[in-house]
């Protein structure tokens, strides 16, 4: 017998869509072999209508697709705009049509109910609103109007013009009688339930001269849209529920077995712990639509998601909903990177952010995830030379190593830098990754002085002490600016005396500024790297002042052994307009990253990357007026 399995019979009506799932053993050969859907002919052949290799028959053009889900061992054939001509015997299979790896499917498309027997058909989605129109003649204008539902053999009164409402419809039905000019009454039913489906009869008058009209109400549960995203990547659920629920609380939930749909996030402030740091619900538009972005996709994120609207912020009977089936592809194009990066207070982290290598010219961004309200991600730095004011001198985004990875360095770490950070670009929105920065106990590895003051016209030498653990690393000094950190010449002064239990492999490397000018004022970093991969950094602020006494200045380490300073920025710092990832690329693919006011605590930092990796690094958090 064939190992392929699927529905043996599919019954539908004209104009509908079907979604046929075929199951196969997910061996590596089966996962990658051709998948097909063919129609069996009278003489035994099977004519391909659609295949996974891109072929689509003219009969299916514009109305069918075939999607393979290799991780699940399934493929799905969607066929829309069904007609009775589609009725017949089909096969879904793997490999070549004539081979035995297939399953027989019988598709029967019957004529839609249409207006048979003067019945008006209403086809409405679950949770939405239907208006059933009921015409009547003049002689019944003043008489009782009513709507009945056929339950088995008996009509049951649903609503009438005398004020009766069936308890099953309480709070969600009304009967409207149009102005005297129109011989029409209508019944509006909101928050439609599956149980509302069925045959209705509206009636004007109660005697033999009454006017009657039949209605067939079909309530459709939305078929889930299939979404297939890469492990470690990102998914966006766009939820458009209509303007009638614009002011109702919105939610995204994930169905577990049974009738439970566990809230992932809602507009009432609830968020599932498993999505902490990697989810944003954008502010909804006036039409009630909203989007939810989830980054750092995990295998366990796969499943059925529903978005909806209900005052409770969770799924209830009558909630209008949209559905998705999320598959997470483990054969991901997005490389593994640490999901947690650890840094010592006063030290630094260097985070590698992946991006789509085909988009090397895209603008790179780094933002700090904030959980307040529905989540937001204010930008901290970009690759075009913008750095949030509070991060000047301690944050840099570098295009290195390139070819699909950029680097973000954050130093002068404090406990307030702990949190979740997102790497993203203005290109492929699926390449958004999340990293959590954790601040751990310990001592920075690099030792630099704290405050350094240089004198105009003199020479300044600033030491940086590198422990022996960095003996094989390249050591450098650079001057920070908002586009990066420009390398400067430095001198190796031999072994350092700053470390206990550290042999001759420790190093003292000095930065020398000759004939200091005002332009030399600013932040300087010393650090280590291996090729284009950056390690720990330490930052020193050099202030420049007028000459007081002649001679060159040689700064010793002793002056700077104070604990890391956790002050927020001085009020004298120049503020520039802040940027936040909120409405921009995270939600509307076509918008550029907008500049919006960000009221976040100025002393926090951020980075993106991803698995657990310890990093140290030294710097002091002293702030100076520019």
């Amino acid at each position: 017998k064939s190992p392929i399995f699927g529905p043996e019979e599919v019954n539908s009506v004209e104009g509908n869509s079907v979604s046929i799932t075929c199951y196969y053993p997910p061996t590596s050969v089966n996962r990658h072999t051709r998948k097909y859907w063919c129609r069996q002919g009278a003489r035994g052949g099977c004519i391909t209508l659609i295949s996974s290799e891109g072929y689509v028959s003219s009969k299916y053009a514009g109305r069918a697709n075939l999607t393979n889900f290799p991780e699940n061992g399934t493929f799905v054939v969607n066929i829309a705009q069904l007609s009775q001509d589609d009725s017949g015997r089909y096969k879904c299979g793997l490999g070549i049509n004539s081979r035995g790896l297939s399953f027989d499917v019988s598709l029967e498309v019957s004529q839609g109910p249409g207006l048979l027997n003067d019945t008006k058909v209403y086809t409405v989605d679950l949770g939405r609103t239907v208006t059933i129109n009921c015409p009547f003649k003049t002689e019944n204008a003043q008489k009782r109007k009513s709507l009945y539902k056929q339950i088995g053999l008996y009509p049951v009164l649903v609503i009438d013009s005398s004020g009766y409402v069936n308890p099953n419809y309480t709070g969600r039905i009304r009967l409207d009688i149009q102005g005297t000019g129109q011989l029409l009454f209508s019944v509006v039913i909101n928050q439609l339930r599956l149980s509302d489906a069925g045959q209705y009869l509206c009636q004007a008058g109660d005697d033999s001269n009454s006017n009657k009209k039949n209605a067939d109400l079909q309530v459709l549960k939305p078929e889930p849209e299939l979404v297939y995203e890469d492990l470690r990547g990102s998914v966006t659920f766009h939820c458009a529920l209509g303007p009638e629920v614009a002011n109702v609380a919105k939610f995204l939930c994930r169905q577990s077995s049974g009738e439970n749909c566990d809230v992932v996030v809602n507009t009432l402030g609830k968020r599932a712990p498993a999505f902490e740091g990697r989810i944003l619900l954008n502010p909804q538009d006036k039409d009630g639509s909203f989007s939810v972005v989830i980054t750092g996709l995990r295998k366990e994120d796969a499943g059925r998601y529903l978005c909806g609207a209900h005052s409770d912020g969770q799924l209830q009977e009558g909630s209008p909903i949209q559905a998705w089936q999320l598959f997470v592809n483990e054969e991901s194009t997005i490389p593994r990177s640490p999901t947690v990066v650890k840094g010592v207070a006063g030290s630094s982290v260097a985070v590698l952010c992946p991006y789509n290598r085909k988009e090397s010219k895209s603008i790179k961004y780094w933002c700090l995830w904030e959980g307040a309200q529905n989540g937001r991600c204010p930008l901290l730095v970009d690759s075009e030379g913008w750095v949030k004011a509070q991060y000047e001198g301690r944050l840099s985004l570098l295009e290195e190593p390139g070819n699909g990875t950029f680097t973000v360095i954050l130093n002068q770490l404090t406990s307030r830098d702990a949190g979740f950070y997102w790497c993203l670009t203005n290109g492929d929105t699926l390449w958004r990754t999340t990293v959590e920065i954790k601040i751990i106990e310990g001592e920075p590895n690099l030792k630099v002085p704290g405050n350094v003051t240089a004198v105009l016209g003199e020479t300044l030498k600033v030491p940086c002490h590198f422990p022996c653990k960095f003996s094989s690393y390249e050591k450098y000094w650079c001057k920070w600016n908002n586009t990066g950190c420009q390398a400067l010449p430095s001198q190796d002064e031999g072994p350092s005396k700053a470390f206990v239990n550290c042999d001759e492999n420790s190093r003292l490397v000095s930065l020398t500024l000759n004939l200091v000018t005002r332009a030399d004022e600013g932040w300087y970093w010393c650090g280590v790297k291996q090729g284009h991969f950056y390690g720990e950094t330490a930052a020193v602020y050099v202030a420049v002042e007028e000459r007081k006494a002649a001679g060159s200045r040689d700064v010793s380490l002793a002056k700077a052994d104070a604990a890391p300073d956790e002050k927020v920025l001085d009020s004298g710092f120049r503020e520039i307009e802040n940027k936040a990832i909120q409405d921009p690329r995270l939600f509307a693919e076509e918008k550029a990253v907008a500049d919006t006011r960000d009221q976040a605590d100025g002393s926090r930092a951020s980075v993106d990357s991803g698995s657990s990796e310890e990093q140290g690094g030294s710097s002091r958090h002293h702030h100076h007026h520019h």
Epitope: F5, V13, V18, S19, Q218, K221, Q255, G258, E259, R304
Partner: nanobody, 126 residues
Framework: QVQLVESGGGLVQAGDSLRLSCAAS????????MGWFRQAPGKEREFVAT??????????YYADFVKGRFTISRDNAKNTVYLQMDSLKPEDTAVYYC?????????????????WGQGTQVTVSS
């Protein structure tokens, strides 16, 4: 909660027919599919047939061993699913369970079904 109650089981001769019914009550609004499983003495519970619906479209799935002999159907107005069993064989003897689900991955997988009835005994004598 969804409650499922099976009926229609009994003792029949090989070659005879039986019709099992499964009535669903309670909060049935999220149910996507209902099906039948069976468990013979000393054996694992196994998939028999499932019917899934979406609006006016329905999908029917059958196990290989019942193809052409069993038919699954439903009456939407009564929230009831039926299993018409024809040409019964002694090896069809088992307790038949009705099951319902709000999710549907592989319809053959027991763990896809959240709700189960108590079962009805079908005995086919030779």
């Amino acid at each position: 909660q969804v409650q499922l109650v099976e009926s229609g089981g009994g003792l029949v001769q090989a070659g005879d027919s039986l019709r099992l019914s499964c009535a669903a009550s309670g909060r049935t609004f999220p149910t996507y599919a209902m099906g039948w499983f069976r468990q013979a003495p000393g054996k694992e519970r196994e998939f028999v047939a499932t019917i899934r619906w979406s609006g006016s479209t329905q999908y029917k799935y059958y196990a290989d061993f019942v193809k052409g002999r069993f038919t699954i159907s439903r009456d939407n107005a009564k929230n009831t699913v039926y299993l018409q069993m024809d040409s019964l064989k002694p090896e069809d003897t088992a307790v038949y369970y009705c099951a319902a689900t709000t999710l549907l991955g592989d319809p053959r997988a027991l763990n896809e079904y959240a709700y189960w009835g108590q079962g009805t005994q079908v005995t086919v004598s030779s």
